[in-house]
């Protein structure tokens, strides 16, 4: 086996040339570039049925540059990958695949979901809401006076909207009925309707007084003895306590 002379072979490419164009170090008429000048990448360019070697400063889409000592080439990304950084790290997948940690997957792993815009597997994002605001004052028709039974509301903000597979957001406002001690509206607080209602009531009372001016009942409501006043206050206090007790046990919550 240790022969002194090597096997003679005919040169494979008698037309190999050193005087090439376009970044080629060596080339042939039939194959185009055979090798490239330093720092350039060899790639096969398909022209119809033929493949021609070309030398490029960067690799085309679907390829990444591999550098070995004095020999660089463009190497194809994996079959499911459109753009890659190297053989094992894809940066953009082909249609129908989702990118996850540099890999192209036909479906996303558990705990992740597909984003059909970026074609990536992303973490499932659940809705996040702020704490409730304090309850609003008890109101009826936008006013805080002139009624006994009204509604109070509290709100919260959505801090994080959910992704497709995330938990849905909870309601952002809550309303419940409230009972307050009836308070007469001051002049400024009275609306048009309030004034009209008072006018009607006064007219009614006037009619009542004129029709029964001799009747002692008509005077009873306006003139009270100190004993009667004290008694009335005591009754009102008891009513108030009962109302508060009721409000604590029966707070109606209406969710919007």
């Amino acid at each position: 086996q240790n022969a002194s002379r090597g096997r003679r072979q005919r040169r494979m490419h008698p037309n190999v040339s050193q005087g090439c164009q376009g970044g080629c170090a060596t080339c042939s008429d039939y194959n185009g570039c055979l090798s490239c000048k330093p720092r350039l990448f060899f790639v096969l360019e398909r022209i119809g049925m033929k493949q021609i070697g070309v030398c490029l400063s960067s690799c085309p889409s679907g390829y990444y540059g591999t550098r070995y000592p004095d020999i660089n080439k463009c190497t194809k990304c994996k079959v499911d990958c459109d753009t890659c950084f190297n053989k094992n790290f894809c940066t953009k997948c082909k249609s129908g695949f989702y990118l996850h940690l540099g890999k192209c997957l036909d479906s996303c792993p558990e705990g992740l979901e597909a984003n059909n815009h970026t074609m990536e597997c992303v973490s499932i994002v659940h809705c996040e809401a702020s704490e409730w605001s304090p309850w609003s004052p008890c109101m009826k028709k936008g006013k805080t006076c002139g009624f006994k039974r009204g509604t109070e509301t509290r709100v919260r903000d959505i801090l994080q909207h959910p992704s497709a597979k995330g938990n849905l957001c909870p309601p952002t406002s809550e309303t419940r009925t409230c009972i307050v001690q009836r308070k007469k509206c001051s002049k400024g607080e009275r609306g048009k309707k309030g004034r009209e209602r008072k006018r009607k009531k006064l007219n009614k009372e006037e009619r009542k007084e004129t029709s029964s001016s001799s009747d002692s009942k008509g005077l009873e409501s306006s003139i009270e003895t100190p004993d009667q006043q004290e008694n009335k206050e005591r009754q009102q206090q008891q009513k108030r306590r009962a109302r508060d007790k009721q409000q604590k046990s029966v707070s109606v919550s209406t969710v919007h």
């Epitope: 072979q9 040169r11 494979m12 490419h13 190999v16 170090a25 060596t26 080339c27 042939s28 194959n31 185009g32 570039c33 055979l34 090798s35 490239c36 060899f42 096969l44 493949q51 070697g53 591999t66 070995y68 000592p69 004095d70 020999i71 080439k73 190497t75 194809k76 994996k78 079959v79 053989k87």
Partner: antibody, heavy 119, light 107 residues
Framework: EVQLVESGPGLVKPSETLSLTCTVS????????WNWIRQPPGKGLEWIGY???????YQNPSLKSRVTISRDTSKNQFSLKLSSVTAADTAVYYC?????????????WGQGTLVTVSS | DIQMTQSPSSLSASVGDRVTITCKAS??????LSWFQQKPGKAPKTLIY???RLVDGVPSRFSGSGSGTDYTLTISSLQPEDFATYYC?????????FGQGTKVEIK
């Protein structure tokens, strides 16, 4: 005509270093890529590594820690050193060349030299 | 590393037969594939490179095809001098790896 001729001892003792030289004629080793390939008796071919036109080298990672490829441009030769040999390194060792991705790989081969590792 | 799986490992054929040898790569090798013929006691000889390009002086009965991971060497009409072992080699990246070889024997 490009010719490659391998030379070196046919017998190497275990744990010693195998040394081979490939002498090239018909072309300069300052162009192309100059390789070592081996073939254990009755088995397939294994690529060992190359030295480039500029003298840069690349070895098969499976052998890298034991392989040294060097050259002597004045003699138009390149060499292989394989350290800490065992019986598993017994093979026919070939030198071969290629000129780039667009041409035939290993267009030219040496005739091969059998190296036996035995005490 | 890219693995090259060559099949069959051996085959028996007669002169004039059409013979097909396949090589499957463990990943896309983008046509960077060569075929070699080796006869006993001799160095391998390059037949085909870049999947389908015939080396000067190689008879036209040898042809190569394939893409991606699957490649084929075809001998259209086997001749007496074609009885040998054939190897595929990928050179898409380093380290280069050869197939295990296919021995073509006389039937």
């Amino acid at each position: 005509e490009v010719q490659l001729v391998e030379s070196g001892p046919g017998l190497v003792k275990p744990s010693e270093t195998l040394s081979l030289t490939c002498t090239v004629s018909g072309d300069s080793i300052t162009s192309g890529y100059w390789n070592w390939i081996r073939q254990p008796p009755g088995k397939g071919l294994e690529w060992i590594g190359y030295i480039s036109y500029s003298g840069k080298t690349y070895q098969n990672p499976s052998l890298k820690s034991r392989v040294t490829i060097s050259r002597d441009t004045s003699k138009n030769q390149f060499s292989l050193k394989l350290s800490s040999v065992t019986a598993a390194d017994t093979a026919v060792y070939y030198c071969a060349t290629y000129y780039g991705y667009g041409g035939p790989w290993f267009a030219y081969w040496g005739q091969g030299t059998l190296v036996t590792v035995s005490s | 590393d890219i693995q090259m799986t060559q099949s069959p490992s051996s085959l028996s054929a007669s002169v004039g037969d059409r013979v097909t040898i396949t090589c499957k790569a463990s990943q896309d090798i983008d046509s960077y594939l060569s075929w070699f013929q080796q006869k006993p006691g001799k160095a391998p000889k390059t037949l085909i490179y870049l999947t389908n390009r015939l080396v000067d002086g190689v008879p036209s009965r040898f042809s190569g095809s394939g893409s991606g991971t699957d490649y084929t060497l075809t001998i259209s009409s086997l001749q007496p001098e074609d009885f040998a072992t054939y190897y595929c080699l990928h050179y898409d990246e380093f380290p280069l790896t050869f197939g295990q070889g296919t021995k073509v024997e006389i039937k």
